[in-house]
Amino acid sequence: AMHVAQPAVVLASSRGIASFVCEYASPGKATEVRVTVLRQADSQVTEVCAATYMMGNELTFLDDSICTGTSSGNQVNLTIQGLRAMDTGLYICKVELMYPPPYYLGIGNGTQIYVIDPEPCPDSDF
């Protein structure tokens, strides 16, 4: 499978936003690329979001997706929003070169995203 690189650890912001770069080494001249973010917990794997894009065009996730992203060459900048402490876990970047053939697939080693829920603001007497 293709080599896919992603950071080992990312800390989400206090607003529950985490960003990381997913970079792949393309063996060929793909024009259509599919990027999927998977979350792995123990032996369970769930799809967080996915987008297909044409090389040179923008990465477009579905309107209701918690992910956004931009692409540049063989790099994809991914942002996951709306994260809470319970969403802490391993997020895996999967890249597929869909067209033209041959089909190539690559799986990153995963980014451990840590999410800390912000402390509620204390009531103020002012």
């Epitope: 499978a1 060929g28 001249k29 053939p101 041959p102 089909y103 697939l105």
Partner: antibody
Framework: EVQLVESGGGLVQPGRSLRLSCTAS????????MNWVRQAPGKGLEWVGQ??????????YYSDSVKGRFTISRDDSKSIAYLQMNSLKTEDTAVYYC??????WGQGTTVTVSS | DIQMTQSPSSLSASVGDRVTITCGAS??????LNWYQQKPGKSPKLLIY???NLADGMPSRFSGSGSGRDYTLTISSLQPEDVATYYC??????????FGGGTKVEIK
């Protein structure tokens, strides 16, 4: 039209060597990782090995059953992949297929190892 | 190495039947799985790639599903020309890219 044509098969005695060739046309050979897959008579498919392309430094990988005996190489200028088989055993008897990625398959060439 | 276990090894069904073949991996393979069709006396052909994508030229009655360790090939309405042996294959690095044992499909 995509074509992969294997050649070089035949009858060979145990312990001897044989070199198979896979000539490709109709697609961009240099973009493809080339694989060899074999099928013993009446049996299932067995992945033999793979050679990646220039962006992957022509890395090679082999199944445990052929490691140290078989060598895969390629010539991108001629669009040919090779399978060099040394120290052949009777259990290497099979139809050998080459594949481009895993998308394109040749028609296969038969290798029989027998004394 | 990751092992691929395919079942059943053979099946016989009537024309029009829905047919399901399963393939299980010994570890999570993240959808890195292909299915192949091999008709008697012919070379294998790519049928499904990346667990769910139908290869060019293959009829839409074939579909693939699954995630994690468990994957399924479905023929929604079996046709006489579907008589073949079907193989799954793990395509996750590092190699070996192991095949399942195959499922021979026949018509009743």
């Amino acid at each position: 039209e995509v074509q992969l044509v294997e050649s070089g098969g035949g009858l060979v005695q145990p312990g001897r060597s044989l070199r198979l060739s896979c000539t490709a046309s109709g697609f961009t050979f240099s973009d493809n990782w080339m694989n060899w897959v074999r099928q013993a008579p009446g049996k299932g498919l067995e992945w033999v090995g793979q050679i990646r392309n220039k962006p992957y430094n022509y890395e090679t990988y082999y199944s445990d059953s052929v490691k140290g005996r078989f060598t895969i190489s390629r010539d991108d200028s001629k669009s040919i992949a090779y399978l060099q088989m040394n120290s052949l055993k009777t259990e290497d008897t099979a139809v050998y297929y080459c594949t481009g990625g895993m998308d394109y398959w040749g028609q296969g060439t038969t290798v029989t190892v027998s004394s | 190495d990751i092992q691929m276990t395919q079942s059943p090894s053979s099946l016989s069904a009537s024309v029009g039947d829905r047919v399901t073949i399963t393939c299980g991996a010994s570890e999570i393979i993240y959808g890195a799985l292909n299915w192949y069709q091999q008709k008697p006396g012919k070379s294998p052909k790519l049928l499904i790639y990346g667990a769910t994508n139908l290869a060019d030229g293959m009829p839409s009655r074939f579909s693939g599903s699954g995630s994690g360790r468990d994957y399924t090939l479905t023929i929604s309405s079996l046709q006489p020309e579907d008589v073949a042996t079907y193989y799954c294959q793990k395509i996750l690095s590092p190699p070996p890219w192991t095949f399942g044992g195959g499922t021979k499909v026949e018509i009743k």
